[in-house]
Interface confidence: medium
């Protein structure tokens, strides 16, 4: 899983002190905007829970792997969904934090619920401020279920979701009818794609048995470890106040991880840091409990003591999770929890063990995922340990998975599972891209999509003249920079190929497919001039031009006409592919538009000097705007529009077009036709209750006319959310918490 943590500071007495920090432990995280290291993104997600607009939140980057969001001015700013996105390419991951108002009517007993496919999920909303009205449950902002206030059990409203499937995942909320959505209890349901203990495409693979509350990822079988734990199976505790996949991060402030909520990639969700619990993560674990949210019990044996951050601390002579193993029993030492090798390499793997009696070479073995047992080729015996070295046969992809080092002596046995990732050296799927060319040089982008695994450590560009048998020239380049191939021959084709490498022995991939790049021909030098033009319709223009007379053949393949619409900031290009042409008809232009026009000669891909520009105004078309547009709310789902016909019409109106948009909404506007042009009013139905809308309209004769003024109006009351505006009544299924 991607090493990405979203931290929420829950000191809520003062919203201005609240902050969210997203920390990435990924190599090269957030380096910038290039394709090899996209930046960390941290934002409030307003798609489901919307809060009143306030001053914009402040985003501060601290180096390449940390970003912090501040500037919350009032408690309602905090309520809702926040997300952090990090990781590159296929590893791009979103971590989500859901914040509930501590003063809400309803509070979640538990915010994050991670369940397995097919399980029954039970969401429990605790009554904090009672109202004797129904409770509305929503799923991702859409109405889902109603509970009557009589249905509260022990001061809680329960929503049972049987046989859940991955699409059931999302944000659920429980709200008293007619209460502010900010007083809702918000939950996050994460449904793993497999049943308990399984992972993989067909859920055929067995999870490694994640310890200390780690959750098995349904796609890759890795354990997503709670904050404060590390290792393939989350078997190792970090030092107090540390988190991250390798315990490399430290909680800010003098009180360590107190008052912080940690959110990790799905399917983990969010929890307090190790050693803390409570809705604001400010309570230390009770005696005998430890770990994230204090969910784990120590049950130490043989005189072990319970540490709320790491679990059992064993006295001398004992080890194991519960101090249940005697030090006489052999023990695997310092085994890395994860190793990475490249495909078809033959790596050496070391496994060290200690114990009494002392382990010897033959007592340590290595077991591959397919059950094959490897015996060590040599052992280094030191006073405190024996290190066995294993020569691994040529690695294949099937060797990816959990390997096991096992030591057996008369004192007992120990084993340690570790993950081996067999990585495929990257092979370009596409040829490099030509950016620009001149007669003696080519500028090439080596960034191409590739099969296999990143990260890319080096990029080699190989090139030679086409059909040549001479050796390839090679240039090693930085993955993120464009390359200039210099000292080339003009008008010559070059075969160019990319080779990518990833870190580690055997990380060089095969060469990618070749592409032919041709150096340019001489550039055209003649400057045409515009002889004249005339308008042949509201959207058609006839243009003619000339070239100076020069001795010798014409260096050019054709002409490029350019029309620049300054008002809209749009350029239209028309290619005339004959160098003998001196006239062209331009069609499909925009009526009533002021264009700047020029023409230039081209040869191959090179453009000659442009003619002096001409300015052309096309005649307008389409009727004027309707007048005096007015909107009036009729109900919680209907708004009536009235208007007056445009003046000075050039012909009979065929229809009106109404544009509807939610005020402040990010979605596309909706256009509705009013097909009876004699009408001067219409009713827009199927709108959402208590929602502000913007309307404007225009008339159509042969073409669409100018837009009217924009009017704004809100629907009334509190009722069903509609499916969308229409001119006939229609009920709906979806809506947003406004």
């Amino acid at each position: 899983a991607v090493d990405l943590t979203l931290l929420a500071n829950l000191r809520l007495t003062d919203p201005q002190r609240f902050f969210l920090t997203c920390v990435s432990g990924e190599a090269g995280a957030g380096r910038g905007s290039d394709a090899w290291g996209p930046p960390l993104l941290l934002e409030k997600d307003d798609r489901i829970v919307r809060t009143p607009p306030g001053p914009p939140l402040r985003l501060a980057r601290n180096g390449s792997h940390q970003v912090t969001l501040r500037g919350f001015s009032k408690p309602s700013d905090l309520v809702g969904v926040f997300s952090c996105v990090g990781g590159a390419g296929a590893r791009r991951t979103r971590v989500i934090y859901v914040h509930n108002s501590p003063g809400a009517h309803l509070l979640p007993d538990k915010v994050t619920h991670t369940v397995n496919k097919g399980d029954t999920a039970v969401l429990s909303a605790r009554v904090h401020k009672e109202k004797q009205t129904d409770v509305i449950w929503k799923s991702n902002g859409s109405y889902f279920y109603t509970l009557d206030w009589h249905e509260a059990q022990d001061g809680r409203f329960l929503l049972q979701l049987p046989n859940v499937q991955p699409p059931s995942s999302g944000i659920y909320s429980a709200t008293y009818l007619e209460a502010s959505p900010l007083g809702s209890a918000f939950f996050r349901l994460i449904v793993r794609g497999c049943g308990a203990g399984r992972w993989g495409p067909g859920c055929t693979k067995e999870c490694p048995g994640c310890l200390h509350g780690g959750v098995c990822h349904d796609h890759d079988g890795e354990c997503v470890c709670p904050p404060g734990f590390t290792g393939t199976r989350c078997e190792q505790a970090c030092r107090e106040g540390r988190f991250g996949q390798s315990c490399q991060e430290q909680c800010p402030g003098i009180s360590g991880c107190r008052g912080l909520t940690f959110c990790l990639p799905d399917p983990y969700g969010c929890s307090c840091g190790s050693g803390w619990r409570g809705s604001q993560c400010q309570e230390a674990c009770a005696p005998g409990h430890f770990g994230a949210d204090c969910r784990l019990q120590c049950q130490c044996q043989n005189g072990g003591t319970c540490d709320r951050f790491s679990g059992c601390v064993c006295p001398s002579g004992w080890h194991g999770v519960h101090c249940e193993k005697s030090d006489r029993i052999p023990q695997i030492l310092n085994m890395a929890s994860e190793l990475e090798f490249n495909l078809e390499t033959m790596p050496r793997i070391n496994c060290a063990a200690a114990g009494n009696p002392f382990p010897v070479r033959g007592s340590i073995e290595l077991r591959k995922p397919d059950g094959t047992v490897l015996l060590s080729t040599k052992a280094i015996v030191e006073p405190e340990k024996t290190t066995a070295e294993f020569e691994v046969p040529r690695l294949v992809l099937a060797d990816s998975g959990f390997w096991e080092c096992r030591v057996s002596t008369s004192g007992g046995q120990d084993s340690r599972r570790f993950k081996v990732n067999v990585k495929v050296p990257p092979v370009p799927l596409a040829a490099p891209r030509l950016l620009t060319k001149q007669s003696r040089q080519l500028v090439v982008s080596p960034l191409v999509s590739f099969s296999g695994d990143g990260p890319i450590s080096t990029v080699r560009l190989h090139y030679r003249p086409q059909d040549s048998t001479m050796d390839w020239s090679t240039i090693v380049v930085d993955p993120s920079e464009n390359v200039t191939l210099m000292n080339l021959r003009p008008k010559t084709g070059y075969s160019v190929r990319v080779q990518l490498s990833r870190p580690g022995e055997g990380g060089e991939g095969a060469w990618g497919p070749p592409t032919l790049m041709t150096t340019d021909c001489p550039e055209p030098l003649l400057q045409p001039w515009l002889e004249g033009w005339h308008v042949e319709g509201t959207d058609r223009l006839r243009v003619s031009w000339s070239l100076p007379l020069v001795p010798g053949p014409l260096v050019g393949d054709g002409f490029l006409l350019r029309l620049w619409d300054g008002t809209r900031g749009q350029e239209r290009r028309e290619n005339v592919s004959s160098p003998q042409a001196r006239t062209a008809l331009l069609t499909g232009l925009t009526p009533g538009t002021h264009y700047q026009l020029d023409v230039q000669l081209y040869h191959c891909t090179l453009l000659g000097p442009a003619s002096p520009p001409a300015h052309v105004l096309l005649p307008p078309s389409g009727p004027p705007a309707p007048r005096h547009l007015h909107a009036q709310a009729l109900s919680d789902s209907e708004i009536q529009l009235t208007w007056k016909h445009p003046e000075a019409l050039p012909g009979p109106i065929s229809k009106y077009v109404v544009e509807v948009q939610v005020a402040g909404g990010a979605g596309d506007p909706l256009w509705i036709d009013v097909d009876r042009p004699e009408e001067t009013s219409t009713i827009i139905r199927g709108l959402n209750a208590s929602t502000r809308y913007l309307f404007r309209m225009r008339a159509s004769i042969q073409g669409l006319g100018d837009w009217s003024n924009t009017v704004e109006e809100s629907t009334l009351g509190n009722g069903l959310q509609a499916e969308g505006p229409v001119q006939e009544s229609r009920a709906a299924e979806e809506g947003l918490d406004q």
């Epitope: 129904d134 509305i136 109405y143 279920y145 109603t146 009557d148 009589h150 249905e151 509260a152 059990q153 329960l158 049972q160 979701l161 049987p162 009818l177 509190n718 009722g719 069903l720 009544s729 229609r730 009920a731 709906a732 299924e733």
Partner: antibody, heavy 113, light 115 residues
């Protein structure tokens, strides 16, 4: 295993009364909404009534409103339907069913009235 | 008279696919994603086979699938088998608003004959 067993059906004259019972087992009865659905001979299903877990909130089809009363005893895991002023058109097999969210997920075998 | 309209009967040969439609209004089928389907064999209680338009409860064959468009819901049974013979009822949760005035409406039922 969820089980629902109806009883109390029988022959009754128009204008008479009858009380149906439904004994529930295999699940936490007090946590679920429950309902009655009937089926006239050779005809389709018709929802009759439903009741919330606490018993404090009930709903009825228009055809039985004012004549039928649904109730429950959570301590006995039992659902009841008291039917008064019975009419010939109330003749049907009456099914007791557990309500989960927006549907009936388990049904009893029914009792004929 | 049932509130939701279903065809009285459909038939198909083993291995074929059939579809049963269920038409309501915007106050029931069209207004909610809460259509369920029940199978009933003669003399037996109804059995839930589809909930919430297209969700199959655990233990129900994946040959049964549901869908909805506008005011019409549909049940499709693929790879017909002799044991599919029986009556099929659609049902929709119906409510006038967000309040608890909850009702359920049923279709008149469709008799499926496997030839």
């Amino acid at each position: 295993e969820v089980q629902l067993l109806e009883s109390g059906g029988g022959l009754v004259q128009p204008g008479g009364s009858l009380r149906l019972s439904c004994a529930a087992s295999g699940f936490t009865f007090s946590s679920y909404k429950m309902g009655w659905v009937r089926q006239a001979p050779g005809k389709g299903l018709e929802w009759v009534s439903s009741i919330y877990p606490s018993g404090g909130w009930t709903h009825y089809a228009d055809s039985v409103k004012g004549r039928f009363t649904i109730s429950r005893d959570n301590s006995k895991n039992t659902l009841y339907l008291q039917m008064n002023s019975l009419r010939a058109e109330d003749t049907a097999v009456y099914y007791c069913a557990r309500v989960l969210l927006h549907y009936f997920d388990y049904w009893g075998q029914g009792t004929l009235v | 008279q049932s509130v939701l309209t279903q065809p009285a009967s459909v038939s198909g040969s083993p291995g074929q696919s059939i579809t049963i439609s269920c038409t309501g209004t915007s106050s029931d089928v069209g207004g909610y994603k809460y259509v369920s389907w029940y199978q009933q064999h003669p003399g037996k209680a109804p059995k839930l086979i589809i909930s919430d338009v297209n969700n199959r409860p655990s233990g129900v064959s994946d040959r049964f699938s549901g869908s909805k468009s506008g005011n019409t819901a549909s049940l499709t049974i693929s790879g017909l088998q002799a044991e599919d013979d029986g009556d099929y009822y659609c049902s929709s949760y119906a409510s006038s608003s967000y309040t608890s005035s909850t009702t359920w409406v049923f279709g008149g039922g469709t008799k499926l004959t496997v030839l």
